[in-house]
């Protein structure tokens, strides 16, 4: 990550509020804890595929299997959540595809929040057929481990039948679960055999047991709730972007920087420049000029378009993104060819001091 001195006449303070541009959103794959997940890298003509998670190289291990264009995660856990990328390296270029993995169960027990289908779980028996409690929909009870982001709503269900109609009560960690045990209490919908906790917090973690009983017997089922805590994080930039580019003198070129951020990102496009004939300041750091930044008068800040380029435009272009929490930056090189040479997409160019304009 480069260090630099900003050229004095390009300081951006105070910043203007960013425009409401759309921050790129990758495709999201959702898995429940314990499930296996398989994702195919959606890139064509891939000679070699490499994988990253949250910008860090991903290799095979006892739960992660990489076969050709497929990534398999066995027995997913919330720690597998994150921003994944597969990069296809070809003979002339490379391309990256991004996707999110979210291992969670926001509305639990295999049901939607509205309980629209719950009525059929309330089974009425012929009054002559006495029967101990039994589960009527075990599919909705298969997931025992529920990892839920803080502040989400959790629902546990134990659809049951019996004659006479059983009653249902809930235990937390083996003890009677009382309303005063959590701020905001909880809801029990007996007709839907459900327990609902809104806006969960870390203290809600634990084992929740439904006990369903009538005079002929008792059955129970236990769910484990884990509350995944959230905090704001620094921006993440899509690997491989901006990409190196080349064009002829007088041509046009575009650099793209894709940003994933959960706090307002400020995007800057920066280039090495000279000041008083020098590329470096007294501190030895290069002078850099802000070409574009997110703000009121700036259109899509994720794209830097250069028109009618000259040889002086050649060099390194840095996409620098910051939010209140931290920064990220990546760079690409622009090669400007004489008019007679045809432009083409370049391979990655290794930066060297001699390459500066």
């Amino acid at each position: 990550r480069p260090s630099f001195s900003l050229v004095e006449d390009t300081t951006l303070e105070p910043e203007e509020p960013p425009t409401k541009y759309q921050i790129s959103q990758p495709e999201v794959y959702v898995a429940a804890p314990g499930e296996s997940l398989e994702v195919r890298c959606l890139l064509k003509d891939a000679a070699v595929i490499s994988w990253t998670k949250d910008g860090v190289h991903l290799g095979p291990n006892n739960r992660t299997v990489l076969i050709g264009e497929y990534l398999q995660i066995k027995g997913a856990t919330p720690r597998d959540s994150g921003l994944y990328a597969c990069t296809a390296s070809r003979t002339v270029d490379s391309e990256t595809w991004y996707f999110m993995v979210n291992v969670t169960d926001a509305i639990s027990s295999g049901d939607d929040e509205d309980d629209t289908d719950g009525a059929e779980d309330f089974v009425s028996e012929n009054s002559n057929n006495k029967r101990a409690p039994y589960w009527t929909n075990t599919e909705k009870m298969e997931k025992r481990l529920h990892a839920v982001p803080a502040a989400n709503t959790v629902k546990f269900r134990c659809p049951a039948g019996g004659n006479p109609m059983p009653t249902m009560r809930w235990l937390k960690n083996g003890k009677e679960f009382k309303q005063e045990h959590r701020i905001g209490g909880y809801k029990v919908r007996n007709q839907h055999w459900s327990l609902i906790m809104e806006s969960v917090v870390p203290s809600d973690k634990g084992n929740y047991t439904c006990v369903v009983e009538n005079e002929y017997g008792s059955i129970n089922h236990t769910y484990h709730l884990d509350v995944v805590e959230r905090s704001p994080h620094r921006p993440i930039l899509q690997a491989g972007l901006p990409a190196n580019a080349s064009t002829v003198v007088g041509g046009d070129v575009e650099f793209v920087c894709k940003v994933y951020s959960d706090a307002q990102p400020h995007i800057q496009w920066i280039k090495h420049v000279e000041k008083n004939g020098s590329k470096y300041g007294p501190d030895g750091l290069p002078y850099l000029k802000v070409l574009k930044h997110s703000g009121i008068n700036s259109s899509n800040a994720e794209v830097l378009a250069l028109f009618n380029v000259t040889e002086a435009d050649a060099g390194e272009y840095i996409c620098k993104v910051s939010n209140y929490i931290g920064q990220a930056n990546q760079s690409a090189w622009l090669t400007v060819l004489p008019k007679q040479q045809a432009p083409g997409r370049e391979k990655e160019i290794t930066a060297s001091p001699d390459y500066l304009e």
């Epitope: 990550r1 105070p14 509020p17 704001p232 620094r234 959960d262 706090a263 307002q264 929490i325 920064q327």
Partner: antibody, heavy 113, light 108 residues
Framework: QVQLVQSGAEVKKPGESLKISCKGS????????IHWVRQMPGKGLEWMGA????????TYSPSFQGQVTISADKSISTAYLQWSSLKASDTAMYYC??????WGQGTLVTVSS | DIQMTQSPSSLSASVGDRVTITCRAS???????SNWYQQKPGKAPKLLIY???NLQSGVPSRFSGSGSGTDFTLTISSLQPEDFATYYC?????????FGQGTKVEIK
């Protein structure tokens, strides 16, 4: 665990210099801004500025530009706030914060003749 | 600079009350809005809500945030004894990252 530990309280005379510190631990110090916030006695919070330790990128509130200097030494995971010439009006509690979520305990600076 | 104006500057409430504090920005600070902090005497501020409505880890669910554009609200659904403190909003969209002047919540 993740924490920021600030240097102890200081009592100084007007015109003296001072450098207070904020040491981070339990996380990657270079990956988060360190913000400095002033709170004068009985008053509210004022954002002074911030530094990104990885590359020493620094930004100041116009109200504090030229009045203080923010720096960092990433090799020892420490950020600094310094004054070259203190004034009585600098008397305040100074907090450092990692982003928004982790705050130091504060350093009380008293400037009095 | 973007000014953040909080109201009221102080309020008296009882345990169990629903408390609402508002913060108005001098200009639109969408799309990623404001933070809310709680501060008790002699203590550092504590982050409650980030980006207007996201509950910070470990913060009780009785705290919630809402709003967009220029108007933001912190709500405490049922005031608890430990909630008597001063609350600050902050915008983190544009330098300088300004705070509101604070709202002191006192016992009635």
């Amino acid at each position: 665990q993740v924490q920021l530990v600030q240097s102890g309280a200081e009592v100084k005379k007007p015109g003296e210099s001072l450098k207070i510190s904020c040491k981070g631990s339990g996380y990657s110090f270079t990956n988060y801004y360190i913000h400095w916030v002033r709170q004068m006695p009985g008053k509210g919070l004022e954002w002074m500025g911030a530094i990104y330790p990885d590359n020493s990128d620094t930004t100041y509130s116009p109200s504090f530009q030229g009045q203080v200097t923010i720096s960092a030494d990433k090799s020892i995971s420490t950020a600094y706030l310094q004054w070259s010439s203190l004034k009585a009006s600098d008397t305040a509690m100074y907090y450092c914060a990692r982003g928004a979520d982790i705050w130091g305990q504060g350093t009380l600076v008293t400037v009095s003749s | 600079d973007i000014q953040m104006t909080q109201s009221p500057s102080s309020l008296s409430a009882s345990v169990g009350d629903r408390v609402t504090i508002t913060c108005r920005a001098s200009q639109d600070i969408d799309p990623y809005l404001s933070n809310w902090y709680q501060q008790k005497p002699g203590k550092a501020p504590k982050l409650l809500i980030y980006d207007a409505s996201n509950l910070q880890s470990g913060v009780p669910s009785r705290f919630s945030g809402s709003g967009s554009g220029t108007d933001f609200t912190l709500t405490i659904s049922s005031l608890q004894p430990e909630d008597f403190a001063t609350y600050y909003c902050q915008q983190t969209t544009s330098h300088p990252y300004t705070f509101g002047q604070g709202t002191k919540v006192e016992i009635k």
